[in-house]
């Protein structure tokens, strides 16, 4: 797992800029771990970014996370966590110009570089659950969430609103 | 904005208990630190705990440590604060307020929205 110093570095910055038109409401550094508390954590591998659900052993440092919350800009009749029709979308980035993006092909969840403005599949719907845990819900398919499937994170798609609470799909984020 | 309206305040002998509730309305509630806060008349608005975003964090004034529990449900968008052993040092109206801004906070400047209040009488 990597280090966070080049989140740190460019927080500031993406203050500063436009993503599809629209700034980011908030953003704040957290790490994301799992309804059963393993962590999310991200490693380079072969020029490659690969996420990985594990047990951190005691003093282990949890790998972070840039989230920058979005206001959805168009009225919207899906279950996110809105009022009067709009919802809260969040993008995840774990170190500079990687964002986590749904494949929605493939059912899988990577780390892409890109430029902004960013495309859609790097935008995912937050529902704020039980116990103060959250999913995340992909703009471009609604009804298929991130989730975790044999230690690794995977789109998994939720046929009743009684499966928002499945455990593979709720996550914790911590500042801590 | 968070819309942020408080309620459980009334009177309670010394050593009670209540427990008061911060219903808000707004999306931004989810993503933003919120706290307690109270103030009796004619001094300024002090402090008394706040909670960041998803709960992890908390925070409290020397004064209640030990005897407030600050909590909250994002799932309902509510906020609480359990007061126990309270004293008459407790009597105050009581606000809670939010900020996008990052936690730990505990200074009233850093909050942009609040409550109305709701008022806690400790008396015998």
């Known amino acids: 797992a990597f280090g966070i110093s080049g989140v740190q570095k460019y927080t500031r910055a993406l203050h500063d800029s436009s993503i599809t038109g629209i700034s980011p409401i908030t953003e704040y550094l957290a790490s994301l771990s799992t309804y059963n508390d393993q962590s999310i954590t991200f490693a380079l591998e072969d020029e490659s970014y690969e996420i990985y659900v594990e047990d951190l052993k005691k003093d282990e440092k949890k790998d972070k996370v840039l989230l920058s919350y979005y206001e959805s800009q168009h009225p919207s009749n899906e279950s996110g966590d809105g009022v009067d029709g709009k919802m809260l979308m969040v993008t995840l980035s774990p170190t500079k110009d990687f964002w986590l993006h749904a494949n929605n092909k493939e059912h899988s969840v990577e780390l892409h570089k890109c430029e902004k403005p960013l495309p859609d599949q790097a935008f995912f719907v937050l529902h704020n659950m039980h116990s103060n845990c959250v999913s995340f819900e992909c703009k471009t398919d609604p009804g298929v969430f991130i989730g975790v499937k044999d230690n690794h994170l995977a789109l998994i798609k939720v046929d009743s609103s009684e499966n928002l609470c499945t455990e593979n799909i709720l996550f914790k984020l911590s500042e801590t | 904005q968070v819309q942020l309206v408080e309620s459980g305040g009334g009177s309670v002998q010394p050593g009670g208990s209540l427990r008061l509730a911060c219903a808000a309305s707004?999306?931004?509630?989810?993503?933003?630190?919120a706290g307690w806060f109270r103030q009796t008349p004619g001094k300024e608005r002090e402090f008394v705990a706040s909670?960041?975003?998803?709960?992890?964090?908390?925070n409290y004034a020397d004064a209640v440590k030990g005897r407030f529990t600050i909590s909250r449900d994002n799932s309902k968008n509510m906020m609480y604060l359990q007061m126990n052993s309270l004293n008459f040092e407790d009597t105050a109206v009581y606000y809670c307020?939010?900020?996008?801004?990052?936690?730990?906070?505990?200074?009233?400047?850093?909050?942009?929205?609040w409550g109305q209040g709701t008022q806690v009488t400790v008396s015998s």
């Open positions: 707004g999306r931004i509630f989810v993503i933003s630190n």
């Open positions: 909670i960041s975003r998803h709960g992890e964090i908390t």
């Open positions: 307020a939010t900020t996008l801004g990052h936690s730990p906070r505990t200074d009233p400047g850093d909050f942009d929205s």
